[in-house]
Amino acid sequence: MMTGTIETTGNISAKKGGSVILQCHLSSTMAQVTQVNWEQHDHSLLAIRNAELGWHIYPAFKDRVAPGPGLGLTLQSLTMNDTGEYFCTYHTYPDGTYRGRIFLEVLESSVAEHSARFQIP
């Protein structure tokens, strides 16, 4: 039975050219996290964190994506095209698969402040 919940940074905004942390956290379960996939709004994978193999950043994102903190992902040198949905998929044993969603809005405005808060989607 899947008892866990995914908490995410929810809806966040950040400045063009800046960076942002995409974070998901699995709670309320003792299940072992075997793999976390990070996926972009067009369903292309950005990165995978496998418990045994470690991190793999997809070549197309190597210059702009840094692993961590933790199982999260840091997106750098943001462009307007980075606006959209991001998904974390937690593969766990024995529970199965959990999914979290984050919406990132990249703002042109130089006064835009990075806003983030943990919330349950």
Partner: antibody, heavy 119, light 107 residues
Framework: QVQLQESGPGLVKPSQTLSLTCTVT?????????WNWIRQFPGKKLEWMGY???????TYNPSLKSRITISRDTSKNQFSLKLSSVTAADTATYYC????????????WGQGTLLTVSS | DIVMTQSPSSMSTSVGDRVTITCRAS??????VAWYQQKPGKSPKLLIY???FRYTGVPDRFSGSGSGTDFTFTISSVQAEDFATYYC?????????FGAGTKLELK
């Protein structure tokens, strides 16, 4: 129980357009999946042709890009394949299959339909 | 395109034997490889994804391993119902590509 069922003509003439439909039951085609066409040639080689996602976005195999169109009818929970200018080399068993965008594997397949291109 | 080279193309074995099939990707696919079983006249069935994750309901005699470019699929003790054709598939990037298949036959 998720089920996919292909339908279409078993025979198409060379240079014509092949049309197949996949009817999905037990899963909405507007939920978090991509809906695929895969074909298997007589020699058993499998070729992924393309998909349409729950949001209607399509991705095609570049080897077919100029000839392929995948569309959907959400009211009937169906998606369709059109392949133009067919030749004998397009003779194959055509499968529709569900791909988990977040799980990234084909978990459900149709039973397949054999399509022969011949005059 | 990523080419998946599978070997052997066929093999003869007996019930109870241990069987290993290999698949080599033409470029690094991390662990993004799935394995499918297909019986004559049927559609492929998912067994393994992400190289080593057993799909729901798949018996534990089926296992997978590997990363980067080299992957292995193993049946620890072949049962009568396992005689079929097995395919590897990379799910690293589109176009998604399959190996040519390995036909497992009764010796």
């Amino acid at each position: 129980q998720v089920q996919l069922q292909e339908s279409g003509p078993g025979l198409v003439k060379p240079s014509q357009t092949l049309s197949l439909t996949c009817t999905v039951t037990g899963s909405s085609i507007t939920s978090d999946y991509a809906w695929n066409w895969i074909r298997q040639f007589p020699g058993k080689k499998l070729e992924w042709m393309g998909y349409i996602t729950y949001s209607g976005r399509t991705t095609y195999n570049p080897s077919l890009k100029s000839r392929i169109t995948i569309s959907r009818d959400t009211s009937k929970n169906q998606f369709s394949l059109k392949l133009s200018s067919v030749t004998a080399a397009d003779t194959a068993t055509y499968y529709c299959a569900r791909w988990g965008l977040l799980r990234r594997y084909f978990d459900y397949w149709g039973q397949g339909t054999l399509l022969t291109v011949s005059s | 395109d990523i080419v998946m080279t599978q070997s052997p193309s066929s093999m003869s074995t007996s019930v109870g034997d241990r069987v290993t099939i290999t698949c080599r990707a033409s470029q690094d696919v991390f662990n993004q490889v799935a394995w499918y079983q297909q019986k004559p006249g049927k559609s492929p069935k998912l067994l393994i994804y992400s190289a080593s994750f057993r799909y729901t309901g798949v018996p534990d005699r089926f296992s997978g391993s590997g990363s980067g470019t080299d992957f292995t699929f193993t049946i620890s003790s072949v049962q009568a119902e396992d005689f079929a054709t097995y395919y590897c598939q990379q799910h690293y990037s589109t176009p998604l590509t399959f190996g040519a298949g390995t036909k497992l036959e009764l010796k």
